[in-house]
């Protein structure tokens, strides 16, 4: 059965001939347990391992360090894969990151990064990125020079304030930076003028909360 194959990520799944988007089990280096993930096999050639998804506000993303570390939610809907898993996967080989966004008017956009990995827990899951392209703004809405991950109970930002408390959710805040895809979910009509919403600054501005987001990774050599 496909579950028994030692897939490291969704790229392995795709290359084994499974080209339908859905939930698959992967075996990540240095992780004791296999992990169920959503594999996007449709976007830009497929093989994408989804590490975050927002679509309907059914899941609370205002959580603490431990939950962001180990992940929460369900890969069939809204979820955060978990920083420990993201770290472990991106330590296996070189990865790229793609972020798919949709606003409440149905407009879609994406941002893509040629290199993506994060540090370990001791390094506060610091974000490392290179090579930004895409349709969600010429300028990157993720901090390119490296930012530590912060949650409501772990203040690792570069602000005298507590970004994760003010803007909600766990994220690579700077001071407090131009994005937060783990912010509060606001429905249509309520999504304007919200600093603590689901924000991607160079797509829809500083206070527009988005309708849906997907963060996904794929090996560079796919």
């Amino acid at each position: 059965r496909e579950e028994e194959k030692p897939f490291r990520d969704c790229a392995d799944v795709y290359q084994a001939g499974f080209n339908k988007s859905g939930i698959y089990t992967i075996y990540i280096n240095n992780m004791p347990e296999p992990k169920k993930v959503f594999c996007n096999m449709d976007v830009n050639g497929g093989g994408w391992t989804v590490i975050q998804h927002r679509e309907d506000g059914s899941l609370d993303f205002q959580r603490g360090w431990k939950e962001y570390k180990m992940g929460f939610g369900n890969p069939s809907g809204e979820y955060w894969l978990g920083n420990e898993f993201i770290f472990a996967i991106t330590s296996q080989r070189q990865y790229m990151l793609r972020i798919e966004l949709m606003d409440w008017e149905g407009n879609r956009a994406y941002s893509q990064y040629d290199r993506f990995h994060i540090g370990n827990e001791k390094q506060n899951y610091r974000l490392y990125l290179k090579g930004h392209t895409g349709t969600a703004g010429k300028q990157s809405s993720l901090i390119l020079h490296g930012a530590d991950f912060s949650t409501k109970d772990a203040d690792n930002d570069n602000c005298m304030c507590k970004c994760a408390l003010m803007l909600t959710g766990g994220w690579w805040f700077d001071a407090c930076g131009p994005s937060n895809l783990n912010g509060m979910f606001y429905t249509a009509g309520q999504n304007h003028g919200k600093l603590n919403g689901i924000k991607w600054h160079y797509f829809k501005g500083p206070s527009y909360s988005l309708r849906s987001t997907t963060m996904m990774i794929r090996p560079l050599d796919f």
Epitope: K138, N158, C159, M160, C161, G177, G205, P206
Partner: antibody, heavy 121, light 107 residues
Framework: QVQLVQSGAEVKKPGASVKVSCKAS????????ISWVRQAPGQGLEWMGG????????NYAQKFQGRVTITADESTSTAYMELSSLRSEDTAVYYC??????????????WGQGTMVTVSS | SYELTQPPSVSVSPGQTARITCSGD??????AYWYQQKPGQAPVLVIY???ERPSGIPERFSGSSSGTTVTLTISGVQAEDEADYYC?????????FGGGTKLTVLG
């Protein structure tokens, strides 16, 4: 419509400090980034630093680090820029300007009228 | 920190097209903004995000971007367009201005 109104002209002696104020009216103050930009006579615009009042975080250009202090008082919707150890080359018009968002990487969509600071012995 | 380079001056006759360039290594990945400043006045934003025009700015003002250079174009230049023009860009923590370009409208 938001307006930024600055304090009046100042004449200071070398070595002294100056504190210029910038009061916002007609809109939300705390969630916008307020920057300070100066312009020496006949010269170009030079960014000094700024603050996002809601986050309380000030950010300074390297050139002015240690000599400039930017603060904000949310209760009065006023931002302040204090420049110490003044020298003659600090003679300039000092503008406050608002970023259109609570983030640095943006346009200055609203400017104050400017405050002339003259440093002379 | 990086620099933005502009020509010190540009001259053009009324009705002609003026082009003011601004170059910088970060511009392929960062937006540029343009300001007009007339003597004794505060700067006014005329172009944002490389090519977008704020409301109230005449259509003759436009912006474009190619690689490390952004360009402010003023079509059908009028006498009132004579001013200093500054480009500006910013990253996550710092703001940079170009040195400014004096636009002279001849005649």
């Amino acid at each position: 419509q938001v307006q930024l109104v600055q304090s009046g002209a100042e004449v200071k002696k070398p070595g002294a400090s100056v504190k210029v104020s910038c009061k916002a009216s007609g809109g939300t103050f705390s969630s916008y980034a307020i920057s300070w930009v100066r312009q020496a006579p006949g010269q170009g615009l030079e960014w000094m630093g700024g603050i996002i009042p809601i986050f309380g975080t000030a950010n300074y250009a390297q050139k002015f680090q240690g000599r400039v202090t930017i603060t904000a008082d949310e209760s009065t919707s006023t931002a302040y820029m204090e420049l110490s150890s003044l020298r003659s080359e600090d003679t300039a018009v000092y503008y406050c300007a608002r970023f259109e968002s609570g983030y640095w990487g943006d346009a200055f969509d609203i400017w104050g009228q400017g405050t002339m600071v003259t440093v002379s012995s | 920190s990086y620099e933005l380079t502009q020509p010190p001056s540009v001259s053009v006759s009324p009705g002609q097209t003026a082009r003011i360039t601004c170059s910088g290594d970060a511009l392929p990945k960062q937006y540029a903004y343009w300001y007009q400043q007339k003597p004794g006045q505060a700067p006014v934003l005329v172009i944002y995000k490389d090519s977008e025009r704020p409301s109230g700015i005449p259509e003759r003002f436009s912006g474009s971007s190619s690689g490390t250079t952004v360009t402010l174009t003023i079509s059908g230049v009028q006498a009132e367009d004579e001013a200093d023009y500054y480009c500006q860009s910013a990253d996550s923590s710092h703001v940079v201005f170009g040195g400014g370009t004096k636009l002279t409208v001849l005649g």
